[in-house]
């Protein structure tokens, strides 16, 4: 069956270059036109570039024209996107997508590869407790959590009590701070009566920096 | 370039409902229109092409129609697997423009948020920064307004919000709003409050604390 396998994404500094690859199998590569489409975090789909099956026709979105170059190697069944002079606004998941026969809609898609354009360097998070108190208690339910702050790049994973606690957990999508670093909160609601007896630990893992933190969250002692 | 305008941006519906999404082109594209479905973290999936031709393997409840500049995608009887984001795409011209997307969400019953506030930890204050977190838990619909007040003065530009995806079990959302200050600024003030407005609340709910007090 048709398969498009992408590689080459990663973190890159503004102004630098990156090359994405899209390796095709399950069809005669040289007969098909393939496009690049991208999706910025939390945004819609944006068409980026196309190269015709014979290489004669290349076309680019205005936003990338003059900076990105599409190419293909039929002997390797691979399509490329060379991205130069990268900007923070180029941060997105990039997809390669194959057309159906000669009609220019996208019947087959790659799995996507994330490109992050940032001047930030890899950094592990600081993990701070969001301690339960009378201000975070409502009708027999208490809320507590962990603030996972100032890390780069995405993602971090958060579990509670090594995965034993899942009910009532909300781990929020990360926000990009003005510093260029990410921050997120993970919270859990528990019975107020359990605060004195049950231990609550958030387990934070940031693989890019090889950082693991286990933070115990307990009521503030006054 | 041909611009594609989709409406609505969000659509709340229940299983079994008939739902319709509209896509308008800024100039005629004949029937050169495709529709895609996308779920979080996944690549888009082709549903429909040439405005009304169903892609192989796509259920017949998906119905496409239209030509020229006006197009619709109808789901005749919404199924649990259909809650996703839908995009139209014109392929009449070189720039294969997409619509901005329509998110089809589960229509829940109104639930007012439970509101909690968290002061910055002593550990964080030692680092020179103070983050105050306001949590809005398990509410529906998604629209909620959070305002920060410090000694009753409205804050702007120094907070960030994040909202969860809709909960698959109870259809609610949760939101965190984080007010970030320097330690020096934090220690200049006493009363920190987040005020929450939501359609399920007859009046705004305010949660607050006095700095330094338990």
């Amino acid at each position: 069956q048709v398969q498009l396998v992408q590689s080459g994404g990663g973190v890159v500094q503004p102004g630098r270059s990156l090359r994405l690859s899209c390796a095709a199998s399950g069809f005669t590569f040289s007969r098909y036109t393939i496009h690049w489409v991208r999706q910025a975090p939390g945004k819609g789909l944006e068409w980026v570039a196309v190269m015709s099956y014979n290489g004669n026709n290349k076309h680019y979105a205005d936003s990338v024209n003059g900076r990105f170059t599409i190419s293909r190697n039929d002997s390797k069944n691979t399509l490329y996107l060379n991205m130069n002079s990268l900007r923070p606004e180029d941060t997105a998941v990039y997809y390669c997508a194959r057309i159906r026969d000669t009609a220019m809609f996208f019947a087959h898609w790659g799995q996507g590869t994330l490109v992050t354009v940032s001047s930030a360097s890899t950094k592990g998070p600081s993990v701070f407790p969001l301690a339960p108190s009378s201000k975070s208690t409502s009708g027999g339910t208490a809320a507590l959590g962990c603030l996972v702050k100032d890390y780069f790049p995405e993602p971090v994973t958060v579990s509670w009590n090594s995965g034993a606690l899942t009910s009532g957990v909300h781990t929020f999508p990360a926000v990009l701070q003005s510093s260029g670093l990410y921050s997120l909160s993970s919270v859990v609601t528990v019975p107020s009566s359990s605060l004195g007896t049950q231990t609550y630990i958030c387990n934070v893992n940031h693989k890019p920096s090889n950082t693991k933190v286990d933070k115990k969250v307990e009521p503030k002692s006054c | 370039d041909i611009q594609m305008t989709q409406s609505p941006s969000t659509l709340s519906a229940s299983v079994g409902d008939r739902v319709t999404i509209t896509c308008r082109a800024s100039q005629s594209i004949n029937t050169w229109l495709a529709w895609y479905q996308q779920k979080p973290g996944k690549a888009p999936k082709l549903l429909m092409y040439k405005a009304s031709s169903l892609e192989s393997g796509v259920p017949s409840r998906f119905i496409g129609s239209g030509s020229g500049t006006e197009f619709t995608l109808t789901i005749s009887s919404l199924q649990p697997d259909d809650f996703a984001t839908y995009y139209c795409q014109q392929y009449n011209s070189d720039s294969k423009m997409f619509g901005q997307g329509t998110k089809v969400e589960v229509k829940g019953t109104v639930a007012a948020p439970s509101v909690f506030i968290f002061p910055p930890s002593d550990e964080q204050l030692k680092s020179g920064t103070a983050s105050v977190v306001c949590l809005l838990n398990n509410f529906y619909p998604r629209e909620a307004k959070v305002q920060w007040k410090v000694d009753n003065a409205l804050q702007s530009g120094n907070s960030q919000e994040s909202v969860t995806e809709q909960d698959s079990k109870d259809s609610t959302y949760s939101l965190s709003s984080t007010l970030t200050l320097s330690k020096a600024d934090y220690e200049k003030h006493k009363v920190y409050a987040c005020e929450v407005t939501h359609q399920g609340l007859s009046s705004p709910v305010t949660k607050s604390f006095n700095r330094g007090e338990c």
């Epitope: - | 709340s12 629209e143 909620a144 307004k145 407005t197 939501h198 399920g200 609340l201």
Partner: nanobody
Framework: QVQLQESGGGLVQAGGSLRLSCEAT????????MAWFRQAPGKEREFVAI????????YYSDSAKGRFTISRDNAKNTVYLQMNSLKPEDTAVYYC?????????????WGRGTQVTVSS
């Protein structure tokens, strides 16, 4: 000035129906969400239903869903609450409220309420 005037309340037997109306005067009805709340004796005011300006988006509380229907006539500046299969626990004062933000529940204007009593 803005006034919201509810009507249509009364005494009804369990299983019966009532239709409440709320007429808005002095208010630009366009762009305004209209909601119904209720308050039973000794209890907090609770949300019942809301209808956005377009009229195509409605939301209900758990207790109202399937039995109550909210609608609006923008030409008449009026919002309605059709209440079917009424239960004794629906007994309350019903208030209409206007949310000019159409989204966030900024209920700037309230009616004085109309009493609904459901007898068993």
């Amino acid at each position: 000035q803005v006034q919201l005037q509810e009507s249509g309340g009364g005494l009804v037997q369990a299983g019966g129906s009532l239709r409440l109306s709320c007429e808005a005067t002095g208010l630009t009805f366009s762009g305004v969400a209209m909601a119904w709340f209720r308050q039973a004796p000794g209890k907090e005011r609770e949300f019942v239903a809301i209808i956005r300006w377009s009229g195509s988006t409605t939301y209900y509380s758990d207790s109202a869903k399937g039995r109550f229907t909210i609608s609006r006539d923008n030409a008449k500046n009026t919002v309605y609450l059709q209440m079917n299969s009424l239960k004794p626990e629906d007994t309350a004062v019903y208030y209409c409220a206007a949310d000019p933000s159409d989204r966030f529940g900024e209920y700037d204007y309230w009616g004085r309420g109309t009493q609904v009593t459901v007898s068993s």
